[in-house]
């Protein structure tokens, strides 16, 4: 399983779709900006084994899928782009699950530790609570879209670390 390449290509396609989903100017929503506290340390490529990287990516993508597959999200975005985004996320999830299947035979290392996962989940909880507090306004969704783009970009740090190890 060529994880860095698989994930990198999927990530890029997901980022392009997220960019295309933007409906309103980010500048008109500056008053709604918020620091969600992305757990950057979780995606520090130097501390990862391959199995942990797989589960870190998966966690990020699954939580993003959960966030964007709600009724409120469907109302906020263009349906065609949203479906393409779902397909991209779903494909990445499948690829990552297949990576675990393929890792059998080599010594199976533990998946990502619980603290790291909880940090990612709490980050997404903060995003959900922010959206609820803002009553899922167009600007709130725009802020969240930009935030997810940023967090997807951060995971490239992990890819670089993995490439060095490979």
């Amino acid at each position: 399983c060529d994880l860095p390449q698989t994930h990198s290509l999927g990530n890029r396609r997901a980022l392009i779709l997220l960019a295309q989903m933007g409906r309103i100017s980010h500048f008109s929503c500056l008053k709604d900006r918020y620091d969600f506290g992305f757990p950057q340390e979780v995606f520090d490529g130097n501390q990862f084994q391959k199995a942990q990287a797989i589960s870190a990516f998966h966690e990020m993508i699954q939580q993003t899928f959960n966030l964007f597959s709600t009724k409120d999200s469907s109302a906020a975005w263009d349906e065609t782009l949203l479906d393409k985004f779902y397909i991209e996320l779903f494909q990445q999830l499948n690829d990552l699950e297949a990576c675990v299947t393929q890792e059998v035979g080599v010594e199976e290392i533990a998946l990502m530790n619980e603290d790291s996962i909880l940090a990612v989940r709490k980050y997404f909880q903060r995003i959900t609570l922010y959206l609820m507090g803002k009553k899922y306004s167009p600007c709130a969704w725009e802020v969240v879209r930009a935030e997810i783009m940023r967090s997807f970009s951060f995971s490239t740090n992990l890819q670089k670390g993995l490439r060095r190890k490979d």
């Epitope: 899928f65 959960n66 699950e97 675990v100 299947t101």
Partner: antibody, heavy 126, light 110 residues
Framework: EVQLLESGAEVKRPGSSVRVSCRAS????????ISWVRQAPGQGLEWMGR????????NYAQNFRGRITITADKSPLTAYLELSSLRFEDTAVYYC???????????????????WGQGSLVTVSS | EIVLTQSPGTLSLSPGEGATLSCRAS???????LTWYQQKPGQSPRLLIY???SRATGVPDRFSGGGSGTDFTLTISRLEPEDFAVFYC???????????FGQGTKVEIK
């Protein structure tokens, strides 16, 4: 916590079709697959197929291809199993089952069935 | 396609005794993708162990899972009266996603 509620028992003739529904409530996500698993009387569990409601993407077990159709509605989150060309050996309890969003890490979540419906008995009899 | 074979078919034991149930796969399975369920008569299955060795919420610590490759075990350290049931192992393989169950092991009161 997710609750799965299936439709009632059915009696069908050989060669006919049956449609079983499964309504999900609680902490549901259309981004997690819903599966159908059946159990013939006194027998073990057999996975039939699954659907990802957000996309309508389906995967079917080899044994059922050509006879099975799984569909879903996103709101309220409901999955449907349709099995055609029924045979006597299709007499079974049909369960819908789903993963849990709470499983850590999430990569394990879709590989298992954390929540199960109460089961729907389908009897094929002439 | 992976085949899971559980043994023994039936285990007759008394409360307080320990039980070891085996699940053998026809080819290598990731321990992360091996799950155990308990099913009592007239009830739906209940998730017990996932990821090979992690206990599901509310599952007592007398239940433990282990193994890797093709050989997996479910151990019940001291059987309680409510533990007597049928136990199933299940694996997941991708792509395409396929879920496979073992035929079950019945743990009955001696």
């Amino acid at each position: 916590e997710v609750q799965l509620l299936e439709s009632g028992a059915e009696v069908k003739r050989p060669g006919s079709s049956v449609r079983v529904s499964c309504r999900a409530s609680g902490d549901t996500f259309s981004s997690y697959p819903i599966s159908w698993v059946r159990q013939a009387p006194g027998q073990g569990l057999e996975w039939m197929g699954r659907i990802l409601p957000a996309l309508g993407v389906t995967n079917y077990a080899q044994n059922f291809r050509g006879r099975i159709t799984i569909t879903a509605d996103k709101s309220p989150l409901t999955a449907y199993l349709e099995l055609s060309s029924l045979r006597f050996e299709d007499t079974a309890v049909y369960y819908c089952a789903s993963p849990s969003a709470d499983i850590i890490p999430s990569i394990l979540g879709t590989t298992l069935f954390a929540f199960w419906g109460q089961g729907s008995l389908v009897t094929v009899s002439s | 396609e992976i085949v899971l074979t559980q043994s023994p078919g039936t285990l007759s034991l008394s409360p307080g005794e320990g039980a070891t149930l085996s699940c053998r796969a026809s080819q290598n399975v990731s321990r992360h993708y091996l799950t155990w369920y308990q099913q009592k008569p007239g009830q739906s299955p209940r998730l017990l162990i996932y990821g090979g060795s992690s206990r599901a919420t509310g599952v007592p610590d007398r239940f433990s899972g282990g193994g890797s490759g093709t050989d997996f075990t479910l151990t019940i350290s001291r059987l309680e009266p409510e533990d007597f049931a049928v136990f199933y192992c299940q694996s997941y393989h991708s792509p395409p996603p396929v879920y496979t169950f073992g035929q079950g092991t019945k743990v009955e009161i001696k």
